[in-house]
């Protein structure tokens, strides 16, 4: 059907609460395009009727709420004047009952649900809430180990929980809760966050430092092969994950089918006070869809991107 297939993974979903996914794929969705959502290769589009439990809301697919049987592969088809892209999103629904029972415990937590606070610093946790404009979010309540958080060290500011003078006791299992209103109906959103504490290290903080990239652009010709290194310094005893992501998905998962873009093997050099890590990303063949897309190098809580751009035309 002439559509370019793009595969991505998205697995951390909770039954019995709202969930939304926005079909964005820059630079494709930045122009004049139409977006249509489908489930499991069905020819019938997802309903656009706002009363439907599952419906399309502009470029979003919205579940009010998500149910156990909603697991599956969803496709959003982005049609432009001269292009067609089909993004496959694999949604797996889990029961989340952390404060009710440990039975059916949470699966492996995605990065949004794993956060770090820095010992002795003023720091914050973020409640990740991704919903379309039609969803009105109420004030956020925060919980730690199933009890509501109170005390002057904690301040709620928009979607963040500010924690002053972080102590070792602040590690644990947090949850942010918000009431979402849509078309007059109310739904509860509860996101669990597992929080670890990290200490500042001798060489200037245990937050990994990304030496390169620097949120910069690279000029590269269409069709060429490109390898970009991500260079990171970190403490010797760190347990940080280092990886390349695109659209908040590991590149190896995002390009799972074509394997056109892959993450390389991590190497490191050991210095007296820190380690220098290198993990590369390889573009076997740069395609038009790669331009303008931020390819993010992640190291623990640090991140930096490169963006590919076409070389400026040579008018000589």
């Amino acid at each position: 059907d002439g559509c370019n297939d793009i595969f991505m993974k998205n697995e951390m979903l909770s039954a019995s609460q709202p969930f939304a996914f926005n079909c964005t794929f820059p630079p494709i969705t930045s122009g004049e395009v139409s977006v249509t959502w489908y489930k499991n290769s069905s020819k019938i589009p997802v309903s656009k009727i706002i009363q439907s439990r599952i419906h399309q809301d502009e470029t979003w697919i919205l579940f009010l709420p998500m149910e156990w049987g909603d697991s599956g592969v969803y496709q959003c088809v982005i049609k432009g004047r001269d292009s067609c892209h089909r993004i496959h999103v694999n949604l797996t629904v889990f029961e989340k009952q952390w404060c009710d029972t440990s039975v059916k415990g949470l699966p492996n937590l995605s990065d949004e649900y794993k956060q770090i606070l820095h010992l002795g610093k003023d720091d914050s946790l973020t409640c990740h809430l991704h919903f379309p404009k039609s969803c009105i979010l109420g004030p956020i309540k925060w919980y730690k180990d199933c009890n509501e958080i109170t005390g002057e060290r904690f301040t709620v500011l928009e979607t963040r929980l500010l924690v002053s003078n972080v102590s070792a006791e602040d590690r644990g299992n947090y949850a942010c809760q918000v009431i979402l209103t849509h078309s007059g109906k109310q739904y509860e959103v509860l996101n669990g966050i597992t929080v670890s504490i990290t200490e500042r290290a001798g060489y200037g903080g245990s937050v990994p430092k990304i030496i390169y990239p620097k949120n910069n652009s690279i000029e590269v010709q269409l069709g060429t092969t490109l390898i970009v290194d991500c260079n990171i310094t970190d403490t010797k005893d760190n347990t940080n994950l280092r990886c390349w992501r695109v659209n908040n998905t590991l590149v190896d998962d995002y390009y799972n089918e074509s394997k056109r873009i892959r993450e390389g093997v991590e190497t490191h050099a050991s210095f007296r006070e820190y380690n220098l890590y290198t993990v590369n990303i390889t573009f076997l063949e740069v395609k038009m869809e790669d331009y303008g897309l931020p390819f993010m190098c992640h190291a623990g809580v640090s991140a930096a991107y490169i963006m590919l751009q076409l070389p400026a035309p040579d008018f000589r």
Epitope: W98, C99, S102, L106, D145, C146, T194
Partner: antibody, heavy 119, light 108 residues
Framework: QVQLVQSGAEVKKPGASVKVSCKAS????????MHWAKQAPGQGLEWIGE????????NYNQKFQGRVTMTRDTSISTAYMELSRLRSDDTAVYYC????????????WGQGTLVTVSS | QIVLTQSPGTLSLSPGERATLSCRAS???????LHWYQQKPGQAPRLWIY???SRATGIPDRFSGSGSGTDFTLTISRLEPEDFATYYC?????????FGQGTKLEIK
């Protein structure tokens, strides 16, 4: 390192109650569910229930409902399992076991407490 | 409740041999929620394999787990003397949590 240390062996008469303790160390006691399991002599394992030490929320196996009470004392990081109206078939080793958030399995176990019910 | 049936009840093998322990569930269990424990006489159970196929810390790679749905297997590729014990499968999918009745692995 994580340790769960249980109270010593008990001998009880039928109809009496027993309260077994499980003292936790090496982790934040209030952040993980604590479970209890029973193992009768020469038999397999049977789940009794769970308690969340921070909220004191409990969930019991229907089979033990009405006879089991799980409590905790956060000041001394200790969980308790009390079994009442004891019968001879309650003779068993009782274990506490901890479940980490996001890791639904028993990674840590107490050493076990033998409860003997005999007239 | 989910009933887990282990077979065989007792398995008599010699060191160096391969052991295959089976665990069958009365209804489907997600692979994330099926675990194996080893227990030796007079000791508490010890986590051996979690989420069907992941070895717990310090467990040698001669142990492997597999399966899905209702049929799960624990395999020991080459038995060592210290492997002789009782192995229990356990599900964490629905309440009440249940264990299999155990497979006793004994020296022939």
């Amino acid at each position: 390192q994580v340790q769960l240390v249980q109270s010593g062996a008990e001998v009880k008469k039928p109809g009496a109650s027993v309260k077994v303790s499980c003292k936790a160390s090496g982790y934040t006691f209030t952040s993980s569910w604590m479970h209890w399991a029973k193992q009768a002599p020469g038999q397999g394992l049977e789940w009794i229930g769970e308690i969340h030490p921070n909220s004191a929320k409990t969930n019991y196996n229907q089979k033990f409902q009405g006879r089991v009470t799980m409590t905790r004392d956060t000041s001394i990081s200790t969980a308790y399992m009390e079994l009442s109206r004891l019968r001879s078939d309650d003779t068993a080793v009782y274990y506490c076991a901890r479940v980490d958030y996001g890791k639904p399995w028993f990674a840590y176990w107490g050493q076990g407490t033998l409860v003997t019910v005999s007239s | 409740q989910i009933v887990l049936t282990q077979s065989p009840g007792t398995l008599s093998l010699s060191p160096g041999e391969r052991a295959t322990l089976s665990c069958r569930a009365s209804s489907s269990v997600s692979s994330s929620y099926l675990h194996w424990y080893q227990q030796k006489p007079g000791q508490a159970p010890r986590l051996w394999i979690y989420s069907t196929s992941s070895r717990a810390t310090g467990i040698p790679d001669r142990f492997s787990g597999s399966g899905s749905g209702t049929d799960f297997t624990l395999t020991i590729s080459r038995l060592e003397p210290e492997d002789f014990a009782t192995y229990y499968c356990q599900q964490f999918q629905s309440s009440p949590l249940t264990f299999g009745q155990g497979t006793k692995l004994e020296i022939k």
